[in-house]
């Protein structure tokens, strides 16, 4: 009787977990005469088989990741080797099982990171990989810090996004690391399959040795300037210094004044771009940004401060 | 020495039936199969079927079933193809061709060609 | 079905001459094919079968070769009987079928 086990020549789809030995029969297709006889072709592996009458099986356990659908064809032949029906495809799909674990591509990572950088961005990335499907729990990866030394007020300085293994600083990090007072630390990373989420779960740990490097993006001392220079403009009076190449550099009035008397380069120099009088405006407060190719800040601003100091040039009123 | 003897030329009207003959001989008649093949003038060989003598058993190219029927006579080791409601697309020469049953399936002795021409 | 093509159509070739002629399947066929000689009168004869195998009683001069798809006959050095039709028929699943022909004339 036809039914799940048995029946005609006709393209079929099996799902047969990996890893297991074989403990039944795929399927039994019935010959319609002159057929007498079957055979199978395409990716067997040697592993599936059909016997003459029609039987097909397997004869060892699958791995999926050496091969995740195997395509075959099955055609009935009659008593002469002529094909008389198909061939027609038959699709065997490899279903995943846990039995890779994950690995860390290096057992050892090295980075550095500007004290003060913005909580939450990257500035390293630990990658692990995972032979098994990743479309199922099993190679669903799971990053976690496991260890990080020192430990100073059982704060944690840095954070790991879960699944893509991006290391960034949290927002006490980013306030209190201090190359000054702890150049070096040391995290011990682990990544878990099943998303972490099983107790039968495989994992893998590695080492991270981060470096803090100073943050030069540091407001200037405030700037003395005499008041009706009759040096040529513009002259230069303080500069910025963002902590990478490539910077683009503006001021900001947030005074919004009629004339704004300074300007900085790329190279975040800040000129004074006329003489100024004390007698109009004593003191200037504005601000140096710092952006990205695509313009966006790259951190917070920094104040700048320009105090004018008198010169003899009112004679006495009554 | 095997040979496959077939019966002469035939002219036959539209519409009529006619059959053709192959008769064997050097060689026991039901071990192998009876191929026949068609060819139209100027043209190239077309497989129409066959027929196993021992269990009279045929499988025929779907292209000429209805139009082709094949049985044998055991008795005189001859085996007949019956070509039914002739058009002028049958005239052609036609062959019987010994098939070695099993595999390899070839055509190992042929007929010498029965012409057929179908004209009113 | 199995279309098999086969090139020349026809081709003029002198005695003692090499040649080899071309039959392709439109799809995989296993081997399973031979070749025939049709000569002038009509009779029809195997020269080889299931790709390789030269069948008995012909000369050595004919040989076949081929796997999957591609398929050829070659005649080492052409003698005057030699000069015929030429057909190859794939056997590997129904309808048999058997290419156009290749005929093969005295220059």
């Known amino acids: 009787q036809e039914g799940k086990f048995s029946g005609p020549l006709k393209p079929m789809t099996f799902s047969i977990y990996e890893g297991q030995e074989p403990s039944q029969i795929i399927f039994q297709f019935k010959a319609n005469p002159p057929a007498v006889t079957f055979e199978l072709t395409g990716e067997t592996d040697n592993i599936f088989v059909i016997e003459r009458e029609g039987l097909l099986y397997y004869n060892r356990a699958l791995d999926r990741e050496t091969r995740s659908t195997h395509n075959l064809q099955v055609a009935a032949l009659d008593a002469n080797g002529i094909i008389v029906e198909g061939p027609v495809p038959i699709t065997i799909k490899v279903k995943d099982i846990n039995d890779n674990r994950p690995t860390f591509l290096q057992s050892k990572y090295e980075g550095s990171v500007r004290q003060n950088s913005r909580p939450g961005k990257p500035f390293l990335y630990v990658n692990a990989t995972d032979l098994d499907d990743p479309a199922t729990p099993n190679g669903q990866l799971y990053y976690q810090i496991v260890i990080q030394l020192p430990m100073i007020n059982n704060v944690m300085y840095f954070q790991i996004n879960n699944k893509t293994g991006a290391i960034s600083l949290t927002r006490e990090g980013s306030q209190e690391l201090n190359p000054a007072k702890n150049p070096s630390y040391n995290l011990v990373i682990s990544v878990k399959d099943m998303g972490g989420q099983s107790e039968n779960s495989f994992s893998d740990t590695t080492s991270v040795d981060i470096i803090v490097t100073e943050n030069i993006w540091k407001a200037p001392k405030p700037v003395e300037m005499v008041e009706n220079s009759t040096d040529p403009h513009p002259i230069k009076i303080t500069q910025v210094r963002w902590n990478d190449p490539g910077a683009q550099y503006s001021l900001v009035d947030k005074e919004k004044l009629p004339r704004f008397p300074f300007s900085i380069d790329q190279e975040g120099d800040i000129y004074v771009t006329q003489p100024l009088d004390r007698e109009e405006k004593d003191a200037y407060v504005f601000y140096a940004v710092a952006k990205d190719e695509y313009g966006k800040p790259l951190s917070y601003p920094l104040e700048i401060h320009v105090k004018v100091k008198d010169i003899n040039d009112n004679p006495p009123t009554c | 020495q095997v040979q496959l003897q077939q019966s002469g030329r035939d002219l036959v009207k539209p519409g009529a039936s006619v059959k053709i003959s192959c008769k064997a001989s050097?060689?026991?008649?039901?071990?192998?199969?009876i191929n026949w093949v068609q060819q139209r003038p100027g043209q190239g060989l077309e497989w129409i079927g066959w027929?196993?003598?021992?269990?009279?058993?045929?499988y025929y190219n779907e292209k000429f079933k209805g139009k082709a029927t094949l049985n044998v006579d055991k008795s005189s080791s001859t085996a007949y193809m019956l070509l039914s409601s002739l058009t002028s697309e049958d005239s052609a020469v036609y062959f019987c061709?010994?098939?070695?049953?099993?595999?390899?399936?070839?055509?190992?002795?042929w007929g010498q060609g029965t012409t057929l021409t179908v004209s009113s | 079905d199995i279309q098999m093509i086969q090139s020349p159509s026809s081709m003029f070739a002198s005695l003692g001459d090499r040649v080899s002629l071309s039959c392709r399947a439109s799809?995989?066929?296993?081997?399973?094919l031979d070749w025939y000689q049709q000569k002038p009168g009509g009779t029809i004869k195997l020269l080889i079968y299931?790709?390789?195998n030269l069948n008995s009683g012909v000369p050595s001069r004919f040989s076949g070769s081929g796997s999957g798809s591609d398929y050829s006959l070659t005649i080492s050095s052409l003698e005057s009987e030699d000069f015929a039709d030429y057909y190859c028929?794939?056997?590997?699943?129904?309808?048999?079928?058997f290419g156009a022909g290749t005929k093969l004339e005295l220059r």
């Open positions: 061709a010994r098939g070695k049953s099993g595999y390899p399936f070839y055509f190992d002795y």
């Open positions: 027929i196993f003598p021992g269990s009279g058993s045929t």
């Open positions: 299931s790709t390789s």
């Open positions: 799809q995989g066929i296993r081997g399973n």
């Open positions: 050097g060689y026991t008649f039901t071990d192998y199969h």
């Open positions: 028929l794939q056997r590997n699943a129904y309808p048999l079928t």
